[in-house]
Interface confidence: low
Amino acid sequence: SAPGEDEECGRVRDFVAKLANNTHQHVFDDLRGSVSLSWVGDSTGVILVLTTFHVPLVIMTFGQSKLYRSEDYGKNFKDITDLINNTFIRTEFGMAIGPENSGKVVLTAEVSGGSRGGRIFRSSDFAKNFVQTDLPFHPLTQMMYSPQNSDYLLALSTENGLWVSKNFGGKWEEIHKAVCLAKWGSDNTIFFTTYANGSCKADLGALELWRTSDLGKSFKTIGVKIYSFGLGGRFLFASVMADKDTTRRIHVSTDQGDTWSMAQLPSVGQEQFYSILAANDDMVFMHVDEPGDTGFGTIFTSDDRGIVYSKSLDRHLYTTTGGETDFTNVTSLRGVYITSVLSEDNSIQTMITFDQGGRWTHLRKPENSECDATAKNKNECSLHIHASYSISQKLNVPMAPLSEPNAVGIVIAHGSVGDAISVMVPDVYISDDGGYSWTKMLEGPHYYTILDSGGIIVAIEHSSRPINVIKFSTDEGQCWQTYTFTRDPIYFTGLASEPGARSMNISIWGFTESFLTSQWVSYTIDFKDILERNCEEKDYTIWLAHSTDPEDYEDGCILGYKEQFLRLRKSSVCQNGRDYVVTKQPSICLCSLEDFLCDFGYYRPENDSKCVEQPELKGHDLEFCLYGREEHLTTNGYRKIPGDKCQGGVNPVREVKDLKKKCTSNFLSPEKQNSKSN
């Protein structure tokens, strides 16, 4: 029988009455156009909803929008359109919400064709009040907040000017012209690329990379011949055109662009691309596209300086520049990532790594599932996860995989069980141990969300018909209760819960349709009375993460240490609460070869932990580029995985000598870089 339908499932007592008392309907006085929702701040309960309706006329499109505000997690909404003078808000810019709990909101208005500049509405009190400000430019992008100071904003104009405000959008100053891309770095630094000749497109590969650390008073050119740049963790990356041909290479800096090193990655041609898949302060996952229109490339993982890279995964599915990849960071367990590969027969298969890209394997077949038609052997197959690529291909997959840092070990995803991703209708699977084991959780496609740090999982069936039923589980998806939240079914459009999965409120969004009109409607359900009491010590159990062999002393060791967590017992129906903090106890492990990546010029044969020299580099001196100088590497093939905390045990030798020779890089070396002031 399907999960939740067998006799072992105990029902949550009197849940219908409890939920009925905590179900709040709000019908929006709007024609159905588009709706967007933003949470303002953390644990504030403030939600802004912007509804937009376009009426196409013969000559132009007339638009109207309404703004609503809730301060009780969506139970009640107030129409605050008058606070923005009933102005039509441009949905493509969304609602620019300030970082942390700044309470800042910027809305960009639609203005008539002949106006000198755009118009914004600003709030710094969680959208209680708004100030209208006319801009001296027409914005091309949404306002971007400095992560360090929410009063500092930057925006690009339609004429490629870089504009900065130091007083939360009250006054604006154009600090540079001919700008293609601008990003905030750390310490209120702005990085941006500029073109000299025609345009961003025409000058691609001939752009300059600039930096300002004082909001435009002075500038430093930190790179030339730039194709593009990106920030990830503490790394600044730039792809740079080679001198002699149309290829480009990645250069990396860890000091905001003062000094650069050439990354030991393959160069790419005109039709190829690089992509930073994930980055933290320790390392980076980099995708390098294969030549030709293959739809795949190679994942490389970096050392702690972002310079030396190891091949992590071949045939990694990534369709085109800015296209689709299934690469997913499983945030509920350290070191775990899931992605897809395109196999030789062109089928797509899911792979998982538990050690930050060191080794990839297939996902274990769920106990309660049979292999589908893609499986050659009916008894041996794997789980394959649907993510961005499947969604882009319009498969019946309403949601990407879901994990939350404070719902330890839980991963929920659509999938199919076979030799490859199937085009058939998927089911929903759950892992409670970070991806090591999986169980079919729900039959058919669903929307799902995690509440109360994993204490409740909520799901709604993905259906073309109007719905009025929500499913919920208090035991990590083993057993399900269904609740009819309205007598009149609605066409469902989305589930919304406060980011961070700490809330106990869920909002079900949709529209009602009658003969003449259709209106937006939301139902907000508070589960607080289902989880009647606060969890106590007895409700938690000790769980060793990454445990695969309890007999082994090193069991659970990943990246040099193991972690024990306090996890809520599945049988406990209680509130983790908004203040819940994940309790974990780390302990250091002895070093083994698993704690080392293969060094530059070395690789790990399949199913072997030893690193062997690449045949083409045997007998050659290993030299690579560092800070514009050539370095000689003495190594026996290993380097510690970034972020690995192991001590003692195996200790391979590694030494780097400065060869005092210049590298052949066309990138600006530090001494050639120039500065200027405004």
Epitope: A373, I421, M424
Partner: antibody, heavy 129, light 107 residues
């Protein structure tokens, strides 16, 4: 208009292979999957497998696993179905059919399977010694 | 695999009368079901998808109903061009499977 044009009739000996082509026109080739369905004389319809023109990924019915290969050429908007180790019971009309295969289009009433909406004219394959 | 069973195998109906065709799935296929019409020497033609939605250009006399395991195709008033074989097909789980067909013949 949208159409699928298949290659002509084939006569093959047992043990041989046959490769049937299906050329799509009138729509974006990569926007829809393609299924292959066969029909033996006087019998019903039998689904053989499906191909995604974007990546070329395939899913075959267990019965044909190991004998059937579906490929595509995006430059010519053509899908191919090759059946090997032919036997007399493979004598049938082979159809290609445009298949949304679980495509979820936005809006009420359209999220379920939308059916094989365009079919080729069929290719008769006769296997006889 | 999911087995689709159609009944009756043959249905004799007079023009202008109502015809009701049944299709049963061995397990739930939700609403992932389509109906096709096939005339001798022709390729099948899509009539109904999503269990109940008429395909483009299909006359209103054709209607589909059902969900889960039991489905029905109804032709409210048979026209001479409706005499053909009708197949149901599921697309809930691979492999796609067809029913054995119902032949609608002139009484």
């Amino acid at each position: 208009q949208v159409q699928l044009v298949q290659s002509g009739a084939e006569v093959k000996k047992p043990g041989a292979s046959v490769k049937v082509s299906c050329k799509a026109s009138g729509y974006t080739f990569t926007s829809r999957y393609m299924s292959w369905v066969r029909q033996a004389p006087g019998q019903g319809l039998e689904w053989m497998g499906i191909i995604n023109p974007v990546g070329g990924s395939t899913s075959y019915a267990q019965k044909f696993q190991g004998r059937v290969t579906m490929t595509r050429d995006t430059s010519t908007s053509t899908v191919y179905m090759e059946l090997s180790s032919l036997r007399s019971e493979d004598t049938a009309v082979y159809y290609c059919a445009r298949d949304p295969s679980g495509i979820a289009l936005a809006g009420p009433g359209s999220r379920y399977y939308r059916g094989m909406d365009v079919w080729g004219q069929g290719t008769t394959v006769t296997v006889s010694s | 695999e999911i087995v689709m069973t159609q009944s009756p195998a043959t249905l004799s109906v007079s023009p202008g009368e109502r015809a009701t065709l049944s299709c049963r799935a061995s397990q739930s296929v939700s609403s992932n079901l389509a109906w096709y019409q096939q005339k001798p020497g022709q390729a099948p033609r899509l009539l109904i998808y999503g269990a109940s939605t008429r395909a483009t250009g299909i006359p209103a006399r054709f209607s589909g109903s059902g969900s889960g395991t039991e489905f029905t195709l109804t032709i409210s008033s048979l026209q001479s061009e409706d005499f053909a074989v009708y197949y149901c097909q599921q697309a809930r789980l691979g492999p796609w499977t067809f029913g054995g067909g119902t032949k609608v013949e002139i009484k």
